[in-house]
Interface confidence: low
């Protein structure tokens, strides 16, 4: 090989050992019969050399550095050449370095021809092995702007006071052009400006200078995004850290087209803007850091550009100003991750602050819009607390558990609407009265409606799930001893059409000791299936529940249990069931941990079924399923 560097070219070539490998046989550069492991060639020198092995690319790397001095004379602007030409160089992993020094008042612009660049983070590598490492200078300090691969959106990087560009090419890569040019610009009065151009839909991940280390103190860095007017851009911060500021505040500023409040200033912890049409700028501003404990400022963010959806121009008003203790969350429904590019699905507050999920709280009116290709990718979950702290104020008061119409009008499916109903301990209890009688969901008779009410205890230490209930059954009311959560869960988009069937009223009533009482008024047409709370896990220890079952005068009720034995084994106490005729008060008592369950029995008058649990041994829980069927009386037994 022969390398000749012209005089005044300001080029230095360095061939040196690369990262050591476990190859047994060493390799040397052979020059004038000398064996060396490093060779430096300066401007004006001509050197002939060879290698002592057949695969020098496994041992050596070559660095070609060109110093460009714009301080003392005119700058060689324009397209940057690869000198010496790659065809004249040995086939080693090679790094071309251009080190441009300029006055602070001079702006330097690196322009990248297509394919543009894509920034990568620490630990990432480029698929083709071609990387661009770009750094700038603040006085004597080198600042890493970033490492970039091909096939991205970054088209230009502007800096001042100098720039160092390193192009790394693997030994096998055929590239023979630098792919960029240098131009001079007026002072940019900041560390750097990165221009990112989107031709169509796509995303770009970008990072602050020196990432993942700290952004230089009190510096300013700007990203300019060129976005076709028919597309929309959204910014989301993937990772950031704030330093300890002594003066000023770390922030990001946006220049957004059409905004009357430019620049729009955001804290890094704020939700960032979305649904922006056309070009915009984003700037990161550092602060004066505490000398003793500076901390670090760093930022990694993503810009997502996509087509606006029909919904993105619609504004929905969610009026929660008259609500309290309520939060509404719009979020992605769980899905399997797809590997291909999926357009973002965002919900936007005031059409500007967009994110993949959004929580609205009571006490205000909210204006929201959507930036999403498919709104079925989102759903809504709502929580509302109705609490009574003073039994004297709340006793006998009633509240309607209805999904507000503002929420039903949103174009996103409601998943859960949970009411947390809180009462003063041992002072008040609750009664739930449905607009339409409820059916308890069982394996034998599952609910097939578009929604159900899930009723569970809301006392943290108590694991008690009363069951899932849907309209169209025989349960007239449910009384519960203390705090519960009632969740309206939807199962089908048809809930919108069936919403009129929802309707549950809760009333605060005088305290009673039983965990739950179900009032059942069976219809003559169907069999009513009822089961104990906490099905599959067993009725909690020492818990008592009752069913008040009405039997019309002209009917007889058949009570049937679906097991021969309850299966419960008591560790302490007794588990028992009482079946009591309401008219005569006559009762039968069954020991559930000893006796067999009663055979089907016929009841001519309304009756109670009361089940009380012991403290069962683990694995031997109390689960009972029974049914009530009405048939016409053939003989009047009164």
């Amino acid at each position: 090989f022969e390398i000749a560097l012209p005089r005044e070219s300001n080029i230095t070539v360095l061939i040196k050992l690369g990262t050591p490998t476990l190859l047994a046989k060493p390799c040397y550069i052979v020059i004038s019969k000398r064996h060396i492991t490093m060779l430096s060639i300066k401007s004006g020198e001509r050197i002939v050399f060879t290698f002592s092995c057949q695969s020098p690319e496994n041992h050596f790397v070559i660095e070609i550095q060109k110093n460009i001095d714009c301080m003392s004379g005119p700058c060689p602007f324009g397209e940057v050449q690869l000198q010496p030409s790659t065809s004249l160089l040995p086939t080693l992993n090679r790094t071309f370095i251009w080190d441009v020094k300029a006055h602070k008042s001079i702006g330097l612009e690196l322009q990248f021809s297509i394919p543009r660049l894509r920034q990568i983070g620490p630990g990432e590598s480029c698929p083709d092995g071609v990387t661009h490492s770009i750094s700038g200078r603040i006085d004597a300090t080198v600042v890493r702007i970033g490492t970039f691969c091909s096939n991205g959106t970054v088209s230009r990087i502007k800096m001042q006071e100098g720039v160092k560009m390193a192009l790394h090419l693997p030994w096998f890569h055929p590239r023979n052009v630098s792919g960029f040019s240098i131009a001079n610009r007026s002072s940019i009065k900041r560390l750097c400006i990165i221009e990112s151009v989107f031709e169509g839909e796509g995303s770009a991940t970008l990072m602050s200078a020196n990432y993942p280390e700290g952004f230089p103190e009190d510096e300013l860095m700007t990203w300019q995004f060129v976005v076709p007017a028919h597309l929309r851009a959204s910014v989301s911060f993937l990772n950031f850290n704030l330093s300890n500021c002594e003066r000023k505040e770390e922030r990001v500023e946006y220049y957004i087209p059409g905004s009357t409040t430019n620049p729009e200033v955001f804290k890094l912890e704020d939700k960032q803007p979305g649904n922006m049409a056309g070009n915009f700028n984003l700037s990161l501003q550092g602060c004066d850091q505490d000398a003793q404990s500076p901390g670090i400022l760093r930022l990694q963010f993503q810009v997502l550009v996509q087509h606006p959806q029909n919904e993105s121009n619609k504004i929905y008003v969610v009026d929660l100003s008259n609500e309290r203790a309520m939060s509404l969350t719009i979020e992605p429904r769980p899905v399997k991750q797809s590997r291909k590019f999926v357009p973002g699905c965002f919900v936007c507050l005031e059409s500007r602050t967009c994110s993949s999920n959004l929580t609205l709280t009571s006490g205000s009116k909210h204006k929201i819009s959507f930036l999403c290709d498919d709104l079925t990718r989102l759903w809504m979950n709502v929580e509302k607390t109705i609490s009574c702290t003073d039994h004297r104020y709340c006793q006998r008061k009633s509240y309607s558990l209805q999904v507000p119409s503002d929420i039903l009008h949103l174009p996103v499916e409601l998943h859960d609407f949970s009411w947390k109903l809180l009462v003063p301990k041992d002072r008040l209890s609750l009664v739930l009265v449905p607009a339409q009688k409820l059916q308890q969901h069982t394996h034998e008779k599952p609910c097939n409606t578009s929604f159900s009410y899930l009723v569970a205890s809301a006392i943290p230490s108590q694991d008690l799930y009363f069951g899932s209930f849907c309209p169209g059954g025989s349960i007239k009311q449910i009384q519960v001893k203390q705090n519960i959560s009632v969740t309206l869960r939807t199962f089908a988009p048809s809930f919108q059409q069936e919403a009129s069937r929802q309707g549950l009223t809760v009333s605060f009533i005088p305290y009673f000791k039983e965990e739950g009482v179900f009032t059942v008024t069976p219809d003559t047409k169907s069999k009513v299936y009822l089961r104990t709370p906490n099905w599959d896990r067993g009725l909690p220890s020492l818990t008592s529940v009752s069913w008040n079952i009405s039997v019309p005068r002209d009917q007889v009720a058949c009570l049937t249990f679906f097991k021969e034995r309850s299966g419960v084994v008591c560790q302490t106490g007794r588990a028992f069931m009482i079946i009591q005729e309401q008219r005569t008060r006559a009762e039968e008592i069954f020991s559930l941990d000893e006796d067999v369950l009663p055979k089907p029995s016929f009841h001519h008058h309304s009756f109670w079924v009361n089940i009380s649990n012991c403290s069962p041994t683990s694995g031997k829980q109390l689960d009972l399923l029974f049914s009530v069927t009405l048939t016409p009386r053939t003989v009047d037994l009164t």
């Epitope: 309290r324 006490g363 109705i386 609490s387 009574c388 702290t389 003073d390 104020y393 008061k397």
Partner: antibody, heavy 119, light 107 residues
């Protein structure tokens, strides 16, 4: 719009009685509770109690049990506060206010009635 | 009963300054706390409900924080019409109580 219109100022002698009225308009009286608040001259606000406008059941704070009576006439959307055996320390502005929700905040107030008790 | 202690008793500020009014409850009352403004010769006016919820028609410069036992009413930039007495009120349990008030006066 919602309004609570209170009766005019009263000048009374110790030992006499007075009945203050509060007329609710712009909403249905029975949908919200009615509370009474007292403010002595140059002093802060003191909650006297409330009346359940659905049932007519009153609740009094401890300092206002005995001589103070809350009542209603729902047919004319009126709430009343009667104070008997007036004392000089009853001199104050009395406000009626509408209670919202199950843990009330007072979103609308009457303009207040000044009761002066002086011999 | 819940005792509410407001501080300072008097706050002297110039228009444009930020006002921070404190209300401390004798025990935790969650967010069952409301703020009222009262001008001389007028009835109180509800400013903030449930510690931090804004009220329709009340300027956005009024904000509140909570829950717990320490509550704050903040006026981001005091306007001339904001000089008045401010009361906090507990709605946690009977009897409902008011703080003794903070007078915001012109400096």
């Amino acid at each position: 719009q919602v309004q609570l219109q209170q009766s005019g100022s009263e000048l009374k002698k110790p030992g006499e009685s007075v009945k203050l009225s509060c007329k609710a308009s712009g909403y249905t009286l029975t949908d919200f509770s009615m509370h009474w608040v007292r403010q002595a001259p140059g002093q802060g606000l003191k909650w006297m109690g409330w009346i359940n406008t659905e049932t007519g059941a009153p609740t009094y704070a401890d300092d206002f049990k005995g001589r103070f009576v809350f009542s209603l006439d729902t047919s004319v959307s009126m709430a009343y506060l009667q104070i008997s055996s007036l004392k000089s320390e009853d001199t104050a502005v009395y406000y009626c206010s509408r209670g919202r929700d199950y843990d009330p905040h007072f979103d609308y107030w009457g303009q207040g009635t000044l009761v002066t008790v002086s011999s | 009963e819940i005792v509410l202690t407001q501080s300072p008793a008097t706050l002297s500020l110039s228009p444009g300054e930020r006002a921070t009014l404190s209300c401390r409850a004798s025990q935790s009352i969650s967010d069952f706390l409301h703020w009222y403004q009262q001008k001389p010769g007028q009835a109180p006016r509800l400013l903030i409900k449930y510690a931090s919820q804004s009220i329709s028609g009340i300027p956005a410069r009024f904000s509140g924080s909570g829950p717990g036992s320490d509550f704050t009413l903040t006026i981001s930039s005091v306007e001339p019409e904001d000089f008045a007495v401010y009361y906090c009120q507990s709605a946690h349990s009977f009897p409902y109580t008011f703080g003794q008030g903070t007078k915001l006066e012109i400096k």
